[in-house]
């Protein structure tokens, strides 16, 4: 099956990193300088991804694979494939269209990335507030005043903080 | 080997929105920029703007205000909206296969001349 | 934006003659990689737009090879060592190094 199929398409023989080249009788050329061919029987090969600006280089181009950037110091990745890169901020701001700005109080952001998130309500749960809440920190809720006698645990450890999704921009 | 084709209506009236989608064929729209560029008759070309396959984009600032381009993966698309048009806007529209955002177009459509006129 | 120019804007020329380009970008086109975000498109009557070089210097794939690229930095030439009359069209350079990429005014290239 693969000689029939060689008679009929020459460029099924050329393999990753090389292209079927038209100009030369359809012989495999290797793929030339930043370029590269992931799959075999190609006719052209692909343009290497520059990382410029705020990207850097993650991972080299090669001739079978194409390069992948992250985000130079300062930023972080956003999008699959790190298709953009958003600046970072301090713990206990978030990025808003006119750069970093503190969380409002009632809110916190114990992250360099992300927004400002409501601290927990404490007595949603029937619990009570036993470390204030910060810009950088969420609230500790402790057991309701009724839950406190002698020998019951003190302290209820918070629920693990959820990273929201980004949107990108 | 991938393919792109523009659609969408030759006349648009001005003030109106335009609207194009470029389909890709022969390939994933998945792990590349796509870009629109346009050509107004008889001059040079312009970028219009670029998405991701994850949904990201970036715009020409001399039209940002206008425009929105858009993805839908599973129909391996991407649209361009341009709103509030003029005649300035009537041109030939091309998507193009970006492999850098915002460099060496390497693969292009056949382009779709819309033109804006009352 | 980073302005680009192109010279000639027209250039006639005989088949089997070479031909040259010039691109000038009003900053350097020279990235930390040393990588020149450079393009050359040659767009055929009736056609879309192609792409011919990459990188300053580097032919894309399938590219018939009298077509080269040179230049670094700010200045950068196109050349073809024996026109064809397939070769007819506008030659566009392009710079890919900035957003919103620009592409310079184009050359017209046409047979004597």
């Known amino acids: 099956f693969e000689r029939t199929r060689s008679l009929q398409d020459p460029c099924s023989n050329c393999p990753a990193g090389t292209f079927c080249d038209n100009n030369r009788n359809q012989i495999c050329s290797p793929c030339p300088p930043n370029s590269f061919s992931s799959a075999g029987g190609q006719r052209t090969c692909d343009i290497c991804r520059q990382c410029k600006g705020v990207f850097r280089t993650r991972k080299e181009c090669s001739s079978t694979s194409n390069a992948e950037c992250d985000c130079t110091p300062g930023f972080h990745c956003l999008g699959a494939g790190c298709s953009m890169c958003e600046q970072d901020c301090k713990q206990g701001q978030e990025l808003t269209k006119k750069g970093c700005k503190d969380c409002c109080f009632g809110t916190f952001n114990d992250q360099k990335r992300g927004i400002c998130r409501p601290w927990t309500n404490c007595s949603l749960d029937g619990k009570s507030v036993l470390v204030n809440g910060t810009k950088e920190r969420d609230v500790v809720c402790g057991p309701s005043p009724a839950d406190l006698s002698p020998g019951a645990s003190s302290v209820t450890p918070p629920a693990p903080a959820r990273e929201p999704g980004h949107s990108p921009q | 080997q991938v393919q792109l084709q523009e659609s969408g209506p030759g006349l648009v009236k001005p003030s109106e929105t335009l609207s194009l989608t470029c389909t890709v064929s022969?390939?994933?729209?998945?792990?590349?920029?796509w870009s629109w560029i346009r050509q107004p008759p008889g001059k040079g070309l312009e970028w219009i703007g670029y998405i991701y396959y994850s949904g990201s984009t970036n715009y020409n600032p001399s039209l940002k205000s206008r425009v929105t381009i858009s993805v839908d993966t599973s129909k391996n698309q991407f649209s361009l909206k341009l709103s509030s048009v003029t005649a300035a806007d009537t041109a030939v529209y091309y998507c193009?296969?970006?492999?850098?955002?915002?460099?060496?177009?390497?693969?292009w459509g056949q382009g779709t001349l819309v033109t804006v006129s009352s | 934006e980073i302005v680009m120019t192109q010279s000639p804007l027209s250039l006639p020329v005989t088949p089997g003659e070479p031909a040259s380009i010039s691109c000038r970008s009003s900053q350097s086109l020279l990235y930390s990689n040393a990588y020149n975000h450079l393009d050359w498109y040659l767009q055929k009557p009736g056609q879309s737009p192609q792409l011919l070089i990459y990188?300053?210097?580097n032919r894309a794939s399938g590219v018939p090879d009298r077509f080269s690229g040179s230049g670094s930095g700010t200045d950068f030439t196109l050349k073809i060592s024996r026109v064809e009359a397939e070769d007819v069209g506008v030659y566009y350079c392009m710079q890919a190094l900035q957003t919103p990429p620009t592409f310079g005014q184009g050359t017209k290239l046409e047979i004597k």
């Open positions: 990188a300053g210097s």
């Open positions: 022969g390939g994933s729209i998945s792990s590349y920029y």
């Open positions: 193009a296969r970006d492999q850098s955002g915002g460099g060496s177009f390497q693969h």
